[in-house]
Amino acid sequence: EPPTACREKQYLINSQCCSLCQPGQKLVSDCTEFTETECLPCGESEFLDTWNRETHCHQHKYCDPNLGLRVQQKGTSETDTICTCEEGWHCTSEACESCVLHRSCSPGFGVKQIATGVSDTICEPCPVGFFSNVSSAFEKCHPWTSCETKDLVVQQAGTNKTDVVCGPQDRLR
């Protein structure tokens, strides 16, 4: 009786179970009653990452430098190439098909999390007592200067974009 289902790593064709090709190999011809499935290794710059019956291997991803991409991990016959972005850039999607420049945090905002090749800069507003007076992808919010520790007094209050201005204490006459 011909099978209706096959074991793992097999597929059903012409009423018989044939072995799938292993990762890194493509299907050349289906098995018969006399021969096993014929498979061939993927060529240079090609891959297949699963047990399969594909007649063509997939091309490795190209990390296009014109899009800000570079190779993070070279592909093999069983794995695709993994791209990442050049320094100062990050991927626009999980597939990392293109890159954009890391966002800078505007004055009044500091860097909460520095960008990576796959994630953008995360900014946060500077809370009371902290400031940022530059647009930066690296600078955190800085604490206001403590005038007291310098034996000075606050002459001008700080904001989220400016530090306090300290000055000498008024002398008692």
């Epitope: 011809s29 098995c31 018969t32 009653e33 006399f34 021969t35 096993e36 014929e38």
Partner: antibody
């Protein structure tokens, strides 16, 4: 008990034709692929032809393609090999074999074909 | 076409000795190889399939190993009835091909 009995061999002149038969018994013939394998005197084994269980698919090596035709009659449990334009190098014992688990798991006793003028 | 090369062509041994027969494929055939035994005046019989799988009714002294391009048939202790010719056969792809055979003879 599985049995394969070949017949039809004999002496034949070059250029002539011959049809070999193989009577199968002891198993469900229509469930198995079948093959012919030959062996020249004192030589090794050489695959000649194969046919799928249903008879739809046939396979041949290049050196016999176009000269040999494998066929089967599942209602008669019989395998055939039609050989045309015979040559001296076709002289051999011809074995009928059953394909079980992709191996030739049962063989007939063979029939001798001699091509000679 | 996949070419199978068997070695040695002849193996001269005494009963009780261990026989090691080699079959080398011209390209990788994974484990898609069978072994057959043929005695004089008889048809071949299947000994081992898929390179190492034993066949019902075949004595346990016969074993096969190997994968890819290099295969071995081992007879652990030769019995008088084991002196015969042994053939390997690949079923990885068409055309089906056999090795030229190894004759195991009595020393």
């Amino acid at each position: 008990e599985v049995q394969l009995v070949e017949s039809g061999g004999g002496v034949v002149q070059p250029g002539r034709s011959l049809r070999l038969s193989c009577a199968a018994s002891g198993f469900t013939f229509s469930n198995y692929g079948m093959s012919w394998v030959r062996q020249a005197p004192g030589k090794g084994l050489e695959w000649v032809a194969s046919i799928s269980s249903g008879g739809d698919d046939t396979y041949y090596p290049d050196n016999v393609k176009g000269r040999c035709t494998i066929s089967r009659d599942n209602s008669k449990n019989t395998l055939y090999l039609q050989m045309n334009s015979l040559r001296a190098e076709d002289t051999a014992v011809y074995y009928c074999t059953r394909a079980g688990g992709k191996a030739m798991d049962y063989w007939g006793q063979g029939t001798l074909v001699t091509v000679s003028s | 076409e996949i070419v199978l090369t068997q070695s040695p062509a002849t193996l001269s041994l005494s009963p009780g000795e261990r026989a090691t027969l080699s079959c080398r494929a011209s390209q990788s055939i994974r484990d898609n190889l069978h072994w057959y035994q043929q005695k004089p005046g008889q048809a071949p019989r299947l000994l081992i399939n898929y390179a190492s799988q034993s066949i019902s009714g075949i004595p346990a002294r016969f074993s096969g190993s190997g994968s890819g391009t290099d295969f071995t048939l081992t007879i652990s202790s030769l019995e008088p009835e084991d002196f015969a010719v042994y053939f390997c056969q690949q079923f990885n792809s068409w055309p089906l091909t056999f090795g030229q055979g190894t004759k195991v003879e009595i020393k």
